[in-house]
C-alpha cells in the first residue's frame, strides 16, 4: 500500500485546514491507527492527534477543541484531520504516520501554509501646497504573510518608493507616493491597491488630494469705461480668483473709506446710482490659509455734461 497526501496545504488565517492522509492499501489490509504530529526542523515531534480504528479520535491537550475528523461518511482508510481556526503559529511541517496490519507503518509529511491577509492603512502626508517641490502625498502600509504587494492607482503624475520590514512570521510593506503639488491635482483620487494570495480581491483605499493654492486676483466690471457715468444704476465690480481652501474677499478703497451706499457682497462690490464721489482706487483683497492676493482698479465716473460741453468747445474752436 501507499500513503496519499499533499505536499502543501494552504489555508487563510481563521479558516479550517484539512490535513489529508489516505492509505491506499491492498485488499485485506487494515488501518489500526493514524498519528498526526508536528515535526518542525530543530524541534521534537509534537503529537496533535491519534485516530484509532476502534477507540476513536484522541487529541493532544495543546490542540483541545481544534482537531476533528472530517464529517461522515468516513472511509476507514482515511486518516485526514481538520485543524480548526488556523493561526499563524500553526504554519509548519506535519507528519501523518499510519499503522496498518499486516503491512506495517507508513509515514508522509506535508507543509501547512497559513496566509495572513493584510489590513492596509493609508496615511496622508503633510499638507500639499502649490509651489512645493517633490512632496509626500500619502503612504500605504500593509502587513501580511506572505508579504503583500502595495501599488498605487491614480491619474496623478508622481513617483513611488517601497520598503519592506520582515517580522518572524510576516512582512510589512510600506509604499510612498510623492508628487509635485499643482492645483490641477485638487480633488483627484489617489488609491492604494493591496494584493495578497489570502484576499479574494485586491483591497483599495482611496485618498482625495487637496492642494492649497490661491490664483492671482483680477477685477471685472470696468471693461467699458464709458458705462461708468453719473447716474448709472447697477454698476458693480467683481473680484475674480480661486483657491483651495476657498478664499474670502475683502474690498477697500485706497484713497479713503468706501463711499456710503456701496454694498460689499463677498466678491462683489455694488454701487448705488453713480456720482463723482465714487471715483477712486478700489482694492480687492483675496485670502485663504495658504496665501493672499490683491488687485486694484481705478474707477473714473464720467460726467456726460462735462463731456458734451467739451465737445461743443472743441467744435466752436474749429
Amino acid at each position: 500500500g501507499e500513503l496519499e497526501t499533499s505536499d502543501v496545504v494552504t489555508v487563510v488565517l481563521g479558516q479550517d485546514a484539512k490535513l489529508p492522509c489516505f492509505y491506499r492499501g491492498d485488499s485485506g489490509e487494515q488501518v489500526g491507527q493514524v498519528a498526526w504530529a508536528r515535526v518542525d526542523a530543530g524541534e521534537g515531534a509534537q503529537e496533535l492527534a491519534l485516530l484509532h480504528s476502534k477507540y476513536g479520535l484522541h487529541v493532544s491537550p495543546a490542540y483541545e477543541g481544534r482537531v476533528e475528523q472530517p464529517p461522515p461518511p468516513r472511509n476507514p482508510l482515511d486518516g485526514s484531520v481538520l485543524l480548526r481556526n488556523a493561526v499563524q503559529a500553526d504554519e509548519g511541517e506535519y507528519e501523518c504516520r499510519v499503522s496498518t496490519f499486516p503491512a506495517g507503518s507508513f509515514q508522509a509529511r506535508l507543509r501547512l501554509r497559513v496566509l495572513v491577509p493584510p489590513l492596509p492603512s493609508l496615511n496622508p502626508g503633510p499638507a500639499l501646497e502649490e509651489g512645493q517641490g517633490l512632496t509626500l502625498a500619502a503612504s500605504c502600509t500593509a502587513e501580511g504573510s506572505p508579504a503583500p504587494s502595495v501599488t498605487w492607482d491614480t491619474e496623478v503624475k508622481g513617483t513611488t518608493s517601497s520598503r519592506s520590514f520582515k517580522h518572524s512570521r510576516s512582512a510589512a510593506v510600506t509604499s510612498e507616493f510623492h508628487l509635485v503639488p499643482s492645483r490641477s491635482m485638487n480633488g483627484q483620487p489617489l488609491t492604494c491597491v493591496v494584493s495578497h494570495p489570502g484576499l479574494l480581491q485586491d483591497q483599495r483605499i482611496t485618498h482625495i488630494l487637496h492642494v492649497s493654492f490661491l490664483a492671482e486676483a483680477s477685477v471685472r466690471g470696468l471693461e467699458d469705461q464709458n458705462l461708468w457715468h453719473i447716474g448709472r444704476e447697477g454698476a458693480m465690480l467683481k473680484c475674480l480668483s480661486e483657491g483651495q481652501p476657498p478664499p474670502s474677499y475683502n474690498w477697500t478703497r485706497l484713497d479713503g473709506p468706501l463711499p456710503s451706499g456701496v454694498r460689499v457682497d463677498g466678491d462683489t462690490l455694488g454701487f448705488p446710482p453713480l456720482t463723482t464721489e465714487h471715483s477712486g482706487i478700489y482694492v480687492c483683497h483675496v485670502s485663504n490659509e495658504f496665501s493672499s492676493r490683491d488687485s486694484q482698479v481705478t474707477v473714473d465716473v464720467l460726467d456726460p455734461q462735462e463731456d458734451s460741453g467739451k465737445q461743443v468747445d472743441l467744435v466752436s474752436a474749429s
Epitope: A35, Q46, L50, K54, H58, V59, S60, P61, S99, F101
Partner: nanobody, 118 residues
Framework: EVQLVESGGGLVQAGGSLRLSCAAS????????MGWFRQAPAKQRELVTS???????RYADSVKGRFTISRDVAKNTVDLQMNSLKPEDTAVYYC????????????WGQGTQVTVSS
C-alpha cells in the same frame, strides 16, 4: 506480557477528588494506548479515557471537564485525576494497555474500587 498495578481508589464524598495511578512493567515497548475503564455493578465495562504515547487524549462525554489523564512514557505510568466526583462515578476502575500488535486493550490491572457517597 505487560503487568499493570493500580493504586489510589477509595471512598469519597460527592464533589470530592481522587487520583488513581497505574504502573506498567514487562513488555512495555509494545504498549500503544493506555487507558482507564470502569465497571459499575450490573453494567458493562466502559472506556473512561485513554491516552496515546504522544499525549493525545480521549474522554467519555460523561467525564469531560472533570477527569484528566496523564502519562509518563519514561516511567511507564498513567494517572487519572478525578475531580467533582458524582455518585454515578462509583465503579471498579481498571487500568488497561493496548498492544501495538493488536490495536485493542489486551492487558488489564486488577482493578481499584472508587465509591462516591452522596
Amino acid at each position: 506480557e505487560v503487568q499493570l498495578v493500580e493504586s489510589g481508589g477509595g471512598l469519597v464524598q460527592a464533589g470530592g477528588s481522587l487520583r488513581l495511578s497505574c504502573a506498567a512493567s514487562g513488555s512495555i515497548s509494545s504498549i500503544n494506548l493506555m487507558g482507564w475503564f470502569r465497571q459499575a455493578p450490573a453494567k458493562q465495562r466502559e472506556l473512561v479515557t485513554s491516552i496515546s504515547p504522544g499525549g493525545s487524549v480521549r474522554y467519555a462525554d460523561s467525564v469531560k471537564g472533570r477527569f484528566t489523564i496523564s502519562r509518563d512514557v519514561a516511567k511507564n505510568t498513567v494517572d487519572l485525576q478525578m475531580n467533582s466526583l458524582k455518585p454515578e462515578d462509583t465503579a471498579v476502575y481498571y487500568c488497561a494497555a493496548e498492544s501495538e500488535r493488536t490495536y485493542y486493550f489486551d492487558s488489564w490491572g486488577q482493578g481499584t474500587q472508587v465509591t462516591v457517597s452522596s
